[in-house]
Every structure is written in C-alpha cells, then in structure tokens.
C-alpha cells in the first residue's frame, strides 16, 4: 500500500508540473481537486513550486466556491488547503484498495491518476 501511495504521490506531482502545458492533465487534476475538495499534493503551497504558474495563483478547482479566476491572487480562506494525496489516498484505501488489488498501472498511467470509473464512483457517493 505504501508503495502504491508513493507512486500516486510521485505521479500526482508530475502531473502538476504538466498542468499549465496540457489541457487533458489539467482537466483530470481539476476534477480530482474539485471532487475531493483538496489542493496540491501535500497542500495548496505545492502550486507555488510549479515554474510556469504564477506564485499567487492556484487552479480554480482549489476554490471552495469554484468560479472562473477564483484561484488568482487567492485568499487561504477561499480555497481547500488540504492536499490531495493524503485525502485521495485515504479514500483509495477505504473504498478501492480493500475491494480490489490495484496495479501500479491503475494509478500511474501517462495521464491516468485514478481510473475514470473510480472517480465516477466517488462523485456519486
């Protein structure tokens, strides 16, 4: 399990790097952040470290009330501060890892952090 979570953490951070450059990656991360009410890998400050992202900005999907541009010049009270790796990891352990053995490919595919099926399952629960 620790290995799986380590892989997920590494992959999530890698996809954060791709966020400004790849619309598909961005849409997946946006959906995860919005659905799981989280921001960044460990926490929202991870977005500061993305070279092509302005340091006073997080993706709009980090906002508690998502509107276009809400992540620009953000105030901490207006965003989800908890990181996604821990939050999604907890959900994965509870809802997925106990139900099926997830291969590293399930978590670490090129643009695939969690399967669409798993996200869909979370979204409706």
């Amino acid at each position: 399990r620790d290995k799986v979570m380590s892989e997920f953490n590494n992959n999530f951070r890698q996809q954060m790097e791709n966020y400004p450059k790849n619309n598909h990656t961005a849409s997946i991360l946006d959906r995860m952040q919005a659905d799981f009410k989280c921001c960044g890998a460990a926490n929202y400050t991870d977005w500061e470290k993305i070279p092509s992202m302005s340091k006073n900005r997080v993706p709009d999907s980090c906002c508690i009330n998502v509107t276009v541009g809400c992540g620009i010049n953000f105030n901490e009270k207006a965003i989800h501060k908890e990181g996604c790796v821990e939050k999604i990891g907890g959900w994965l352990r509870k809802n997925v890892l106990e139900q099926k053995l997830i291969s590293e490919e399930d978590l670490g595919g090129e643009q695939k952090l969690i399967s669409e099926e798993d996200l869909h399952h979370h979204h409706h629960h």
């Epitope: 500061e48 340091k55 006073n56 541009g69 010049n73 953000f74 105030n75 901490e76 009270k77 207006a78």
Partner: antibody
Framework: QVQLVESGGGLVKPGGSLRLSCAAS????????MNWIRQAPGKGLEWVSY????????YYADSVKGRFTISRDNAKASLYLQMSSLKAEDTAVYYC????????????WGQGTTVTVSS | DIQMTQSPSSLSASVGDRVTITCRAS??????LNWYQQKPGKAPKLLIY???SLQSGVPSRFSGSGSGTDFTLTISSLQPEDFATYYC??????????FGQGTRLEIK
C-alpha cells in the same frame, strides 16, 4: 473600528537592526494576507513583503531579501518585520497593510512608522 | 515582473475640472488593478478595486475603467480635497506587488 497601528520605527546606524510591529484590531486577523509597504522620502510606494493568513506563504522584494523577515502572531493579531543589515536606502515610512486578496485591493493601511538609517 | 507606468507624472487642474489619469501594465493583468489616493503625511487610501469597482465610502465622482493593459482613473468634477497623489497597483501576478510611480494632482 478596523485599525492597524505600527510601532518600532526609529533612527538606526547602517548595518543595524530594527523590529517593526503592527497591532491589528476590529477585524478577524486570520481572514487576511498582510503586507509591509514602504515609502522613501519624496518617493512612491514600494512593496516590501507579504505573508499569508496562516503564515505558510511569505515573499519579499528583491531589495530586502535575506535581510528582512516577515512574521505574524495570529493569537495576538500582530504582524512583524525584523529588519537587519539596514542600509541608507531602507530609510522610509513603513506601512502595515491589510489585503483581502483576490481582486479587492489593499483596503486598510496603518498610519506608518518612520525608519531612518543614518550614521 | 509586471511594470506599471502612470501618466502624467504630475497634473495641474482646477476645482470642477474633469481629470483622467492613465496606467499601463507591461503585460495583461485582466482587471486586477487598484487605485489609491495619498495626501501629504497620510497613508494611502483605496479608491477603486478590480479596475472599476468603487471602494465603500469613496465619492461617486471617482470612477475607473479598463482591462488588460490599459486603465484609467477619472474624477468627474474635481473637489478641493481631491488634490493628492494617485497610484495604480496590480495584483494579477505577484510577487512582487507593483505600483505605478504616482501622479501628483496639483491646483492650477
């Protein structure tokens, strides 16, 4: 009422240190980013540093990086600026400024405290 | 860093005049532009935020417009208390928070 009151300014020799304080009242301190902004005599406004609500994020102007340290004590609703290795060009009025962020603008300013660096 | 350039640097006008001050950003800042007024010996005061929104308590003779790189502050009918220095400031991409160099509005 909403108020920011700076203190700690004074005359200091080049290379010396000074600690500015700002006491906030009349609002929920943790709802805001806070800034230090300065104004040299007869000059315009220059941003010095900001710190986030929780203190997790802090940034400095290049002109003070490595010499100044911003901090906040949310329990005391206070903002601080520790200044060291002071130079003549740091002479200015220093303002403590409340920042709601997003698109709202810096809406509350203290009265300012004067720092003079001179031998 | 985003540079903010104000024009003119100084301006002479009379009570009742309509006055316009412009501010240009070195790159697009959307509408993340604020205007401040500062009187001698006093702290700056927020007048306009988000390019065109009037801060609470500010007289309606002040207005702001623009987006992207070009912005204006307009005082529709100058009052004696409006003679001061005005600054624009961007908050779109920080750090650093950057201000214009200021426009000094003097009595003609």
């Amino acid at each position: 009422q909403v108020q920011l009151v700076e203190s700690g300014g004074g005359l200091v020799k080049p290379g010396g240190s000074l600690r500015l304080s700002c006491a906030a009242s009349g609002f929920i301190f943790t709802d805001y980013f806070m800034n230090w902004i300065r104004q040299a005599p007869g000059k315009g406004l220059e941003w010095v540093s900001y710190i986030s609500n929780s203190g997790n994020i802090l940034y400095y102007a290049d002109s003070v990086k490595g010499r100044f340290t911003i901090s906040r004590d949310n329990a005391k609703a206070s903002l601080y600026l520790q200044m060291s290795s002071l130079k003549a060009e740091d002479t200015a009025v220093y303002y403590c400024v409340r920042d709601p962020r997003m698109f709202y603008g810096m809406d509350v300013w203290g009265q300012g405290t004067t720092v003079t660096v001179s031998s | 860093d985003i540079q903010m350039t104000q024009s003119p640097s100084s301006l002479s006008a009379s009570v009742g005049d309509r006055v316009t001050i412009t501010c240009r950003a070195s790159q697009s800042i959307s509408s993340y532009l604020n205007w401040y007024q500062q009187k001698p010996g006093k702290a700056p005061k927020l007048l306009i935020y988000a390019a065109s929104s009037l801060q609470s308590g500010v007289p309606s003779r002040f207005s702001g417009s623009g987006s992207g790189t070009d912005f204006t502050l307009t005082i529709s009918s100058l009052q004696p208390e409006d003679f001061a220095t005005y600054y624009c400031q961007q908050s779109y991409s920080t750090p650093p928070i950057t201000f214009g160099q200021g426009t000094r509005l003097e009595i003609k």
